[in-house]
Interface confidence: low
């Protein structure tokens, strides 16, 4: 159904609709407004003073006829001022003007709310020429109105660099309430008050709001939009929505879930990403966050060795990126690892514990009590030592590395020997006589070579010298001993 407003010569009925100059399409499909009417159509439905000929712009032509009489002022004829219709209905309205034939190329443009409507597929302009004037009727039609079509429409025509503007035609599209603000899902602390907001608009106004909690109305009396619902507190999850009512009917907002914050679920799938002698890289999958963002996580580490004192090391880290490198661990040790995470409510339970092991590292100390002496009869240097403490080996001992440096006038020569793990002595051949031999020993595990012992020096005399005595690791603070035999 198309609602049409056009010019006719009928008298204007007194208050045919809600306001003078208005068109209520649901009741009065056709309305005309005579030129002589005492009421002028105006935006916002307010009538002008009786007797005023026109509210739009008027152009006074400067051209005169043969009799030298001036032409009458040009103005758009009056038309309907206010059209009210329901959403999705069709509407057609027009503006008309009579233009003397001396003017050529007159065009009419349509404007809405101060902006020109381009792409005139809605607009049709018809010309009705006569002897002296041409009647021009510009029609504008909308087949299915929407709320966005609400507004003030005018026609404009340019003549002699003058702009002629019609009175506005106000289109009011009425429909069910339209939400401009709906309640939003929230995560709230148990028994703590919170607010929900709902706002809807017409036309038609007013719009009244009812609140609904878990399918039951909260307020018996409606509140004018906008409405704020204060909920004093919840002990369990609830769903809220709001109903917006106006004369056209009812619109229901989306239902929003209000969740109660709780402690998180424990992390799952704790796994070992990488393991070194002194560190273990772990990752985990966070549990459910209890409707509150994770703040941080705690990694709990305890020695799995039954003889350990059972103390727990606690490492705190940020909740992201679900990855943590546990450091300061002993080499070749077994650990139980659990992860717990917290949100603003509290800590989760600990994840299932997993077992992890560090790898071997290089020994952290050198062999002890290194002693070196010359076995002149066999032309060998005998070396003895004590193995480092087991705890500081950082792995299973696989042997020792012996460095012996021979220095005499102008010669310096370093040699390396490997010795099996069971030995605590070694014998090396004399390389140079009349020289100093400097010996250092390091323990070796699969994790690498440990630090070398402090150097022990012994002088190897020329052949045929007298007795010899051992040389050993110096006491702390002493200079390197050089034993000359």
């Amino acid at each position: 159904a198309i609602t049409e407003a056009r010019e006719e010569a009928k008298p204007y009925p007194l208050f045919p609709g809600p306001f003078p100059g208005s068109l209520q399409t649901d009741h009065t499909p056709l309305l005309s407004l005579p030129h002589a009417s005492g009421y002028q159509p105006a935006l916002m439905f307010s009538p002008t003073q009786p007797g005023r000929p026109h509210t739009g712009n008027v152009a006074i032509p400067q051209v005169t006829s043969v009799e030298s009489k001036p032409l009458p002022p040009l103005a758009f004829k009056h038309t309907v001022g206010h059209i009210i219709l329901s959403e999705h209905k069709g509407v057609k309205f027009n503006c008309s003007i009579s233009v003397p034939n001396i003017y050529q190329d007159t065009t009419i443009s349509w404007w809405k709310d101060g902006k020109e409507l381009l792409g005139a597929h809605h607009a049709i302009t018809q010309f009705y020429p006569d002897d002296e004037v041409t009647a021009i009727i510009a029609s504008f039609s909308i087949t299915s109105v929407q709320r966005s079509d609400n507004g003030s429409y005018i026609c404009k025509m340019k003549i002699n660099n003058e702009e002629i503007v019609s009175d506005p035609i106000y289109i009011e599209v009425q429909g069910l309430p339209h939400f401009t603000k709906q309640p939003e899902s929230m995560n709230v602390t148990r028994n703590t008050a919170f607010n929900l907001t709902c706002q809807a608009v017409g036309p038609p106004e007013p719009v009244n709001i009812f609140w609904v909690q878990n399918s039951s109305r909260v307020n018996e009396q409606p509140e004018k939009s906008p409405s704020v619902l204060t909920v004093p507190g919840l002990t369990e999850m609830a769903v809220f929505s709001c109903e917006a009512h106006n004369d056209k009917g009812l619109t229901v907002s989306k239902g929003v879930q209000i969740n109660i914050k709780a402690i998180p679920s424990p992390p799952t799938e704790v796994s070992i990403r990488n393991s070194t002698a002194h560190s273990i890289l772990i990752s985990w999958v966070p549990g459910f966050d209890g409707y509150s963002p994770f703040r941080n996580c705690s990694i709990q580490v305890k020695e799995a060795d039954p003889l350990s004192n059972g103390s727990v090391m606690i490492f705190n880290t940020s909740a992201l990126p679900h990855l943590y490198q546990i450091k300061q661990l002993q080499a070749l040790a077994n650990y139980s690892i659990g992860v717990s995470c917290m949100n603003e409510i509290g800590w989760s339970a600990v994840s299932p514990w997993i077992l992890a092991s560090t790898t071997e590292g290089a020994p952290s100390v050198a062999p002890l009590n290194v002693t070196v002496f010359l076995n002149e009869s066999s032309d060998n240097v005998d070396i003895r030592w004590m193995k480092p403490p087991t705890k500081q080996q950082d792995g299973e001992l696989v042997g020792y590395r012996i460095s012996h440096v021979w220095q005499s006038a102008g010669i310096s020569k370093e040699l390396l020997e490997e010795v099996g793990q069971n030995g605590s002595r070694a014998r090396i051949s004399v390389q140079v006589h009349n020289a100093t031999c400097t010996v250092r020993i390091a323990a070796v595990t699969r994790g690498g070579v440990g630090p070398f012992s402090d150097p022990v020096k012994i002088f190897i005399p020329a052949h045929g010298w007298v007795d010899y005595a051992p040389s050993s690791t110096p006491a702390p603070g002493n200079a390197d001993p050089v034993l000359i035999i």
Epitope: H278, M313, F315, N316, K327
Partner: antibody
Framework: EVQLVESGGGLVQPGGSLRLSCAAS????????MNWVRQAPGKGLEWVSY????????FYADSVKGRFTISRDNAKNSLYLQMNSLRDEDTAVYYC????????????????WGQGTLVTVSS | AIQLTQSPSSLSASVGDRVTITCRSS??????LAWYQQKPGKAPKLLIY???SLESGVPSRFSGSGSGTDFTLTISSLQPEDFATYYC????????FGQGTRLEIK
Amino acid sequence: EVQLVESGGGLVQPGGSLRLSCAASGFTFSSYSMNWVRQAPGKGLEWVSYIISGSDTIFYADSVKGRFTISRDNAKNSLYLQMNSLRDEDTAVYYCARDETVVRGVINYFDYWGQGTLVTVSS
Amino acid sequence: AIQLTQSPSSLSASVGDRVTITCRSSQGISSALAWYQQKPGKAPKLLIYDASSLESGVPSRFSGSGSGTDFTLTISSLQPEDFATYYCQQFISYPTFGQGTRLEIK
């Protein structure tokens, strides 16, 4: 401005005891792990001990284990090092140092240091 | 314990020189390494952490690089205030420091 001020150093005989204090200001002391680091005269730096913000994780260097005790009082913004059975080799300037990371039970690097207090162990 | 070896032990240079100090670890430590500057009678000052990150307030002429076992501290253009002793420190295990590198005016 972050400030760490050590006190309590002095001359003590071998086998004796001493208690060092470190007064912290200019930051939220209770959020940070703290350390003691020492430096023997003319020598390099040696880490001594670590305590996490909540005092539930503590580490010691092997050289002081069983003889030194680290503690803290978050209400007083203070860090302590109780040193017993002191030896000649404990002679050093002792620095209180803040661990760079908030609430992580791992020793990292040290972003703020005090000016140090000298401990001399000698008969 | 993880051992850190700095080289050289001492170094003479002039204002405007580019200086490089190296630190070698006895085992892989990823990028868990820091560099400090210490002047006589003063506490150490943090320069670089995580091997290459510049501490806030430290001049950009200081830079760090390396990963695993070999690390470098570079001063791109020496200034008079840079003459000091420099230490590296690992923090993947219980902290240990290098023996120090003394940077002197030539």
